[in-house]
């Protein structure tokens, strides 16, 4: 059985993986602000945590998927202010018991150390300093993602 | 609500630079960017570039060699020089409140009166 | 940098009537990202349309913005004596953002 949330997740993940491939992206575009090989987007305005996901969606982007502590260090510190909480792509799963990515993945457990409970309906956010785990219908703010393409050299074999 | 409030000298001698101060009041100045846009005499609006409130810019290609941007989010300010000024440059400049792409405040909500900037000896 | 071009540059009508003004772009505008502007003689210009369609906070109902791609269109549907403008088009779904030369919208 599974919940709205994921249901959701999993529609918008099928539809953009419908979608035609487009050509890389070398450069962040405008108001995107780069961060090592991803280009990120903050909202100013707030916002449940599906809500969020679609607007990811229709910006041909997606809720923000964080590697390591490594990357979210690098994110907190894109955040000025430390009362601000922004949602990234990591929901509870009802189904899986688990915490799970919105691209299927699971939450390694030492990635991420979570503030609040695992449960039904709960949504992760981040601040400045922690993460959170949240009511996934609290209107927050979110970060949305686009990858870069790596420029790789072509080698060429000797002549 | 938020409000925008420009300042600085209304005559620029040529080859001078010229100095433009914007002051938010009623709102924060964080997560959003904020556009200098400029209105010649009787013409159109040509944008002139963006700052975000962490310091990163977009400039208009066609100014960019004379233009900087900065901000100060503890004054709630931010700043626009552009060098080298002709008579060109003689213009209404606007600052604004760019919402960007994120909705419900999408592309410039809000924006100051104007300061008419004339380039003259 | 993409072009917007204005249609038509000046548009006569009475109070009541219903207005069309067109912006054609050179290429197509990423996620619909174009705006629509008014101005008054001695004032800032003033957001009216954001998204192609979606109204500004505070603008009233007879104002509406359609379009996609290339070719979008404000329609003001009765004219109030207070319309008679300025009005602006701007894509911002690509740098450098750009506006139309403008419609000038005056009384019959």
């Known amino acids: 059985q599974k919940s709205s949330i994921e249901k959701c997740s999993v529609d918008i993940q099928q539809s953009r993986n419908k979608t035609t491939e487009r050509p890389g992206l070398l450069n962040c575009p405008i108001y995107w602000q780069q961060l090592r090989e991803k280009c990120l987007l903050f909202s100013h305005t707030v916002n449940p945590w599906n809500n969020s996901l679609a607007d990811c969606s229709t910006k041909e982007s997606s809720l923000l998927l964080i590697r390591d502590k490594d990357e979210l260090i690098h994110t907190q510190n894109l955040i000025r202010d430390k009362a601000i909480l922004f949602w990234i792509g990591l929901n509870f799963s009802l189904s899986e018991k688990n915490w799970k990515w919105i691209n299927g993945s699971f939450l390694n457990s030492n990635d991420l150390e979570i503030r609040g409970d695992a449960k039904e309906n709960s949504c992760i956010s981040i601040s400045q300093t922690s993460v959170y785990s949240e009511y996934c219908s609290t209107e927050i703010r979110w970060i949305c993602q686009k990858e870069l393409t790596p420029v790789r050299n072509k080698v060429y074999p000797d002549s | 609500q938020v409000q925008l409030q420009e300042s600085g000298p209304g005559l620029v001698k040529p080859s001078e630079t010229l100095s433009l101060t914007c002051t938010v009041s009623?709102?924060?100045?964080?997560?959003?960017?904020w556009s200098w846009i400029r209105q010649p005499p009787g013409k159109g609006l040509e944008w002139i570039g963006y700052?975000?409130?962490?310091?990163?810019?977009n400039y208009n290609p066609s100014l960019k060699s004379r233009v900087t941007m900065s901000v100060d989010t503890s004054k709630n300010q931010f700043s626009l020089k552009l060098t080298s000024v002709t008579a060109a440059d003689t213009a209404v400049y606007y600052c604004?409140?760019?919402?960007?792409?994120?909705?419900?405040?999408?592309?410039?909500?809000?924006w100051g009166q104007g300061t008419m900037v004339t380039v003259s000896s | 940098e993409i072009v917007l071009t204005q249609s038509p540059g000046t548009l006569s009508l009475s109070p009541g009537e219903r207005a069309t003004l067109s912006c054609r772009a050179s290429?197509?505008?990423?996620?619909?990202?174009l705006a629509w502007y008014q101005q008054k003689p001695g004032q800032a210009p003033r957001l009216l349309i954001y998204?192609?369609?979606s109204r500004a906070t505070g603008i009233p109902d007879r104002f509406s913005g359609s379009g996609s791609g290339t070719d979008f269109t404000l329609t003001i549907s009765r004219l109030e004596p207070e319309d008679f403008a300025v009005y602006y088009c701007?894509?911002?779904?690509?740098?450098?953002?750009?506006f139309g030369q403008g419609t000038r919208l005056e009384i019959k």
């Open positions: 701007q894509q911002y779904g690509s740098s450098p953002i750009t």
């Open positions: 998204g192609a369609s």
């Open positions: 009623g709102g924060s100045i964080s997560y959003y960017y």
């Open positions: 700052i975000y409130f962490s310091g990163s810019t």
């Open positions: 290429q197509s505008i990423s996620g619909s990202y």
């Open positions: 604004a409140r760019d919402g960007g792409i994120v909705g419900a405040t999408e592309a410039f909500d809000i």
